[in-house]
Amino acid sequence: QNASRGRRQRRMHPNVSQGCQGGCATCSDYNGCLSCKPRLFFALERIGMKQIGVCLSSCPSGYYGTRYPDINKCTKCKADCDTCFNKNFCTKCKSGFYLHLGKCLDNCPEGLEANNHTMECVSIVHCEVSEWNPWSPCTKKGKTCGFKRGTETRVREIIQHPSAKGNLCPPTNETRKCTVQRKKCQKGERGKKGRERKRKKPNKGESKEAIPDSKSLESSKEIPEQRENKQQQKKRKVQDKQKSVSVSTVH
């Protein structure tokens, strides 16, 4: 390895060769490289029960190179580390460990979460949403005319998706009942005849009651506040006809 060790090896093994392979400055048949050419790193490679000296331009995975006056050598990273700058700073951990402040941890500290893609401990990111956009025009079956009862919808955007441990996003869609403008449909705008046209007029208070947007319900993940059984929904309708209630998509 270093100069003095090289001399010891030379005494032990008279067959030291100066015509060495692969970057060796001096070598022996038994021990392989004893010293390296300038800038190359000395490393010990295990072959069966024996360790052989090799000279490398960069150190293998799990090792880092250090330059001393008498030797450039490969030094082992810490046991849980795959790639490191030195013993203090790991840059990639072994499988099952997470990188945090240059160290490898089996669990991330409080306030951080494990990113299983990068295998790092990262800050928990909570959901962020924009302000609500304005309500859409009041429509029934896509038409904005000819019917007294319809629905209107408003949406907001997700600005920041949450990380695994982050707070879930609040609803991004809201739909409520509304009164369609009392204007006659033009030719081709007419809605379907039949049941809908014969329905009796709603009470005044019913014109702004929120109803579920079936599409948004299908695509939603429920959050606890949104879970209601049919009985509760009926009860709520009776009790609070005049409130605007949201049923929304959760991301």
């Epitope: 880092y64 330059r67 001393y68 700058f85 030195n86 203090n88 700073f89």
Partner: antibody, heavy 116, light 107 residues
Framework: EVQLVESGGGVVQPGRSLRLSCAAS????????MAWVRQAPGKGLEWVAT????????YYRDSVKGRFTISRDNSKNTLYLQMNSLRAEDTAVYYC?????????WGQGTMVTVSS | DIQMTQSPSSLSASVGDRVTITCRAS??????LAWYQQKPGKSPKLLIY???SLIHGVPSRFSGSGSGTDFTLTISSLQPEDFATYYC?????????FGQGTKLEIK
Amino acid sequence: EVQLVESGGGVVQPGRSLRLSCAASGFTFSDYDMAWVRQAPGKGLEWVATIIYDGSRTYYRDSVKGRFTISRDNSKNTLYLQMNSLRAEDTAVYYCATHDKTFDYWGQGTMVTVSS
Amino acid sequence: DIQMTQSPSSLSASVGDRVTITCRASEDIYSDLAWYQQKPGKSPKLLIYDVNSLIHGVPSRFSGSGSGTDFTLTISSLQPEDFATYYCQQYDNYPNTFGQGTKLEIK
């Protein structure tokens, strides 16, 4: 938490000796190469000496070779710097530091003043 | 020994300024370069290693670049706590040597 605490500094006459100590805690001392780095008043940083993790090899800057000796006691987690034949130009704050290519962790330093 | 020369030796700047400190090596040191920050009466603190790798906890306004013999430390937007002395250090060769330092002062 890594802690390095130097002691042993003081005022000494030229030609006399001084022994600095550095008590280490918060890391596996016997795994790390250690060094002394000094800083003369109002000047820059200057590496002085390094000892490898097991104490088997030591390295010195030319101006202190033969006068300073770096040593370590891994059972006591302590690094030493024996300074003999001190000169006025050795006046500085002496820091002990982990030395693994870079100087990652530093002590608070101990002042050595060489003056008659 | 490899000589490390920093410029400027001192520099006055204001909070919010972008600041660049240069370090030149007397011979090729590849990417074996580190930067340290030292505040008055305190020990130095490692900021950057391998030219541009930031130590964890060091703000991202600090960055390093260069290779071979010419290197720079850049602070993109100076903060009050950044006023200090900065040193470069090469670890390609023994003895490991430092630049003479760049003192960053408030204008």
